[in-house]
Interface confidence: medium
Amino acid sequence: LVPHLGDREKRDSVCPQGKYIHPQNNSICCTKCHKGTYLYNDCPGPGQDTDCRECESGSFTASENHLRHCLSCSKCRKEMGQVEISSCTVDRDTVCGCRKNQYRHYWSENLFQCFNCSLCLNGTVHLSCQEKQNTVCTCHAGFFLRENECVSCSNCKKSLECTKLCLPQIENVKGTEDSGTT
């Protein structure tokens, strides 16, 4: 006995994983198309195959689907310094990345720019450069960190955050200023 209720009480229907509800007949579940293919025609009836066709060049589907069209392949953003790591295939979008000794800075969820990793001149590497994070530098004495570069304390103005790090140097500069005014 298959459980059944009248249409009045029956709310709706939904298919299990790997299947989708037939758009014209909500009593049928059709098998989704494999990745690399798209939906050309819905399954004609229960147990019958969905008509799936392979994506054409320049397009892809990365997961099982019932899309009427494949998705267009992404293009790497040269103006952002991106390079192609792997080209688009029917079941995988283009993979873009950065060159060696560069890291990704994300401007938004899907947009990144490639920048050169800091070399930590006048300092030491605290954390190595990562795929999505610049090198973290620790500066030598007499230098302070500004925009991830070690800058000489002679460039430290009293109004900047560097005053604590460059305190001895600032006091010396202040002392010579005082002696010059007498």
Partner: nanobody, 119 residues
């Protein structure tokens, strides 16, 4: 008459847990795969999880895998959904569902139970 009565919903903070129950009657519970379907506010139906008649096979939608556990007690004609590490996006009305065959959709009845995940 087929009846599926869901319970156990409520308001819970993100990261919290809830256990939903579904008391079934009016059909031979042990003969059918069962599942949970949810509908978030203003959205369509989403298949969440499924369990075979003998409870030897379970399936989960990607977004709940590792957080939700479906189970059943055939002696009590009851289906369960243990929900851990709840997220705001899990907020929905959860319905108990009967799966009647490989090419048939889930069909669900009852009023459902509302799960709200909010701080």
């Amino acid at each position: 008459e087929v009846q599926l009565l869901e319970s156990g919903g409520g308001l819970v903070q993100p990261g919290g847990s809830l256990r939903l129950s579904c008391a079934a009657s009016g059909f031979t519970f042990v003969k059918y795969s069962m599942g949970w379907v949810r509908q978030a506010p203003g959205k369509g139906l989403e298949w969440v999880s499924q369990i075979s008649d003998t409870a030897d096979r379970t399936y989960y939608t990607h977004s709940v895998k590792g957080r939700f556990t479906i189970s059943r007690d055939n002696s009590k004609n009851t289906l369960y959904l243990q929900m851990n590490s709840l997220r705001a996006e899990d907020t929905a009305v959860y319905y108990c569902a009967i799966y009647t065959g490989r090419w048939a959709p889930f069909e669900y009845w009852g009023q459902g139970t509302l799960v709200t995940v909010s701080s």
